[in-house]
């Protein structure tokens, strides 16, 4: 029985060239988190494994940093980074929980003048 819920930062925006933290939080369950995957569309960005720690996909090593916590920091953002990001929590005994974040990377001037979503 899956009783938990994933809380995410939802829709967020950031400036081209800047960085952003993607955060998810699993609540309302006592399930043991065995692994968290971070994915963009069907591309694996990073894994945080309970036994092995962090693994960053080689193609993202230069621009992705683990943390804080089970979150993920994206650096040197480009407009191509705009899109959906998913946090996938593998847990026992509940199973798999998925959270979604939409990131919009804006040109500097757009971000300064009325971005649709504000970064806290």
């Amino acid at each position: 029985m899956m009783t938990g819920t994933i809380e995410t930062t939802g829709n967020i925006s950031a400036e081209k060239g800047g960085s952003i933290i993607l955060q998810c939080h699993l609540s309302s369950t006592t399930a043991q988190v065995t692994q968290v995957n971070w994915e963009q569309q069907d591309q694996l960005l990073a894994i945080c494994n309970a036994d092995l720690g962090w693994h960053i996909s080689p193609s993202f090593k230069d621009r992705v940093a683990p943390g804080p916590g089970l979150g993920l920091t994206l650096q040197s953002l480009t407009v191509n980074d705009t899109g959906e990001y998913f946090c996938i929590y593998h847990t026992y005994p509940d199973g798999t929980y998925t959270g979604r974040i939409f990131l919009e990377v804006l040109e500097s001037s757009v971000a300064e003048h009325g971005a649709r979503f504000q970064i806290p």
Partner: antibody, heavy 120, light 107 residues
Framework: EVKLVESGGGLVKPGGSLKLSCAAS????????MSWVRQTPEKRLEWVAV????????FYPDSVKGRFTISRDNARNTLYLQMSSLRSEDTALYFC?????????????WGQGTSVTVSS | DIQMNQSPSSLSASLGDTITITCHAS??????LSWYQQKPGNIPKLLIY???NLHTGVPSRFSGSGSGAGFTLTISSLQPEDIATYYC?????????FGGGTKLEIK
């Protein structure tokens, strides 16, 4: 080349015990979760147990919980399944499987299997 | 436990045909579904993971689709080496469970 070789199967009486082994080679054994999966005489597949890469957690279905124990020796690249209080319904071909590091439920490589028959 | 129901349980087709095997989960499993192929007298081998992703070395005539509770495995241009039993498996929740298998034969 990933290689998984099971051993230890045989004929055992109901209520008896048996210990299966799986010798792994061709990959970094200590970096992968491992499972046991069995195939019944009717050719149905049933997941039996999983152990994390470092051995910090083990999970079982209710059908074997309390009777079967999965363990591993990363120094010897070997996976084990200790089976006790065996029942006729435990009769099956037992496969050792490697779990995909991205998605822990996926059995990406299988051994040849070892046969267990529980009969009086 | 999540039940995985495969249909048909057996299937006979001709070489070059396109065949479809379906797998239905008793509840939503998102895309956490794998397909395995077991040739006669052999061991199961991973074909497809995450509903539609081909495992390394699997020919492109195999494809998977679906999400939620309904999934399909399609083999186009059937080859003699495709004679096997095909199993689906869910990874949404514990215990991980398999379908009953679909035995594919050549006419």
């Amino acid at each position: 080349e990933v290689k998984l070789v099971e051993s230890g199967g045989g004929l055992v009486k109901p209520g008896g015990s048996l210990k299966l082994s799986c010798a792994a080679s061709g990959f970094a054994f200590s970096s992968f979760d491992m499972s046991w999966v069995r195939q019944t005489p009717e050719k149905r597949l049933e997941w039996v147990a999983v152990i994390s890469s470092g051995g910090s957690y083990t999970f079982y279905p209710d059908s074997v919980k309390g009777r079967f124990t999965i363990s591993r020796d990363n120094a010897r690249n070997t996976l084990y399944l200790q089976m006790s209080s065996l029942r006729s319904e435990d009769t099956a071909l037992y496969f050792c499987t490697r779990q995909d590091y991205r998605y822990p439920y996926i059995m990406d490589y299988w051994g040849q299997g070892t046969s267990v028959t529980v009969s009086s | 436990d999540i039940q995985m129901n495969q249909s048909p349980s057996s299937l006979s087709a001709s070489l070059g045909d396109t065949i479809t095997i379906t797998c239905h989960a008793s509840q939503n499993i998102n895309v956490w579904l794998s397909w395995y192929q077991q040739k006669p007298g052999n061991i199961p081998k991973l074909l497809i993971y995450k509903a539609s992703n081909l495992h390394t070395g699997v020919p492109s005539r195999f494809s998977g689709s679906g999400s939620g509770a309904g999934f399909t495995l399609t083999i186009s241009s059937l080859q003699p080496e495709d004679i096997a039993t095909y199993y689906c498996q869910q990874g949404q929740s514990y215990p991980w469970t398999f379908g009953g298998g679909t035995k594919l034969e050549i006419k």
